[in-house]
């Protein structure tokens, strides 16, 4: 008898994973750059602000060239399974006052979830380390008040933002050596 | 089509070595991880070994954790498992498979008894 | 003992709809990690059935759909067939073992 009968393709291979990658992160930058600047003109922010919570951002533009693949995925999950976990928050403890963005957090929110099933699935066919998403470092209660919530959302989207605008860049230089 | 093809099974005696190959083909064998899973008859699948697109990460189930080596040659479009130290209870068909996995081959017989 | 519990037997009549538990802990599905879904027909290979909880390869029938919540998951085949008795198996990657888990497997039976 002749060798067995192959296997019909799957949807996607590893390389088709990364670009589908890239291009749900350009999106969600797109996203995330469009509804900071919602909240700036509703909410304008006096000067910048940060979560305890939040994750430090992962890359600068010098250690760009020296990034390896594991690393930068690993990373990037971690840190926007925080990100997802955080606007899911924000979403639960918003005042009224950031209830009129509710739909934009909500697609946010689902976009995010997207991109980390994919980042998963290119991790799991190239069959790299996953670890294990840590929760939030500081446990999210409700903000001290309607301006705490509105500082979060500032923190929350310009951290998502840089960190996106990193990893936009961190991937399209991972094509080139998978 | 993608092809995953096993080989070198066969009847071992308790405490001898084998090495299985798989050649593959129909994908880019160097952009995906591979696994070999095993089914001992009659019984379920259990993850066995994987090795990393490019060779940097491998681990392994604690069942085989020091006598199964998992190994690969990209240039070849093929798959290694050597295994030493073969026990009774490694008797079972071992399968290739690559990526999630993915795709899995037909499986090679490997019998362990004396 | 494996991993991922699921029920050792299921069975269904023609044209009815049948679901397949698999249960797992934090360090598995519970951890965010997605299921895959394996169908293995007699005699022959698993076959990819679902991946990524509820994502479908080219080629599998819209029949089958997969879902998670929590620390389970599940697989539903609805317009059941003969030709669908097999055994079904989940999967998930283990943080614990850094490596995928299996199911016990579920052996569906068409009446």
């Known amino acids: 008898p002749g060798p067995p009968a192959g296997s019909p393709r799957v949807s996607s291979d590893p390389r088709a994973d990364l670009d589908s990658a890239v291009l749900l992160t350009r999106s969600l930058l797109a996203d995330t750059r469009q509804l900071a600047a919602q909240m700036r003109d509703k909410f304008p922010a006096d000067g910048d602000h940060n979560l305890d919570s939040l994750p430090t951002l992962a890359m600068s533009a010098g250690t760009l060239g020296s990034l390896q693949l594991p690393g930068v995925l690993t990373r990037l999950r971690v840190d926007l399974m925080s990100y997802f976990r955080h606007v899911q928050w924000l979403r639960r403890a918003a005042g009224p006052s950031l209830k009129t963005l509710e739909p934009e957090l909500g697609a946010l929110q689902a976009r995010l979830e997207r991109l980390l099933r994919r980042l998963q699935l290119l991790m799991s066919r190239l069959a790299l380390p996953q670890a294990a998403p840590d929760q939030p470092a500081v446990p999210l209660g409700p903000p001290a008040s309607a301006w705490g919530s509105i500082r979060a959302a500032h923190a929350i989207l310009g951290g998502l933002h840089l960190t996106l605008d990193w990893a936009v860049r961190g991937l399209l230089l991972l094509k080139t050596r998978l | 089509e993608v092809q995953l093809l096993e080989s070198g099974g066969g009847l071992v005696q308790p405490g001898g070595s084998l090495r299985l190959s798989c050649a593959a083909s129909g994908f880019t064998f160097s952009s995906y991880g591979m696994h070999w899973v095993r089914q001992a008859p009659g019984k379920g699948l259990e993850w066995v070994a994987v090795?990393?697109?490019?060779?940097?990460?491998?681990y392994y189930a604690d069942s085989v954790k020091g006598r199964f080596t998992i190994s690969r040659d990209n240039s070849k479009n093929t798959l290694y498992l050597q295994m030493n130290s073969l026990r009774a209870e490694d008797t079972a068909v071992y399968y290739c498979?690559?990526?999630?996995?993915?795709?899995w081959g037909q499986g090679t017989l490997v019998t362990v008894s004396s | 003992q494996s991993v991922l519990t699921q029920p050792p037997s299921a069975s269904g009549t023609p044209g009815q709809r049948v679901t397949i538990s698999c249960s797992g802990s934090s360090s598995n599905i519970g951890s965010d990690y997605d299921v895959h879904w394996y169908q293995q027909l007699p005699g022959t290979a698993p076959k990819l059935l679902i991946y990524s909880n509820n994502e479908r390869p080219s080629g599998v029938p819209d029949r089958f759909s997969g879902s998670k919540s929590g620390t389970s998951a599940s697989l539903a085949i609805s317009g059941l067939r003969s030709e669908d008795e097999a055994d079904y198996y989940c999967?998930?990657?283990?943080?614990?073992?850094?490596?995928?888990?299996f199911g016990g497997g579920t052996k569906l039976t068409v009446l």
């Open positions: 498979a690559a990526g999630v996995p993915d795709y």
């Open positions: 999967a998930a990657w283990d943080s614990s073992l850094y490596g995928p888990v």
């Open positions: 090795i990393s697109y490019d060779g940097s990460y491998k």
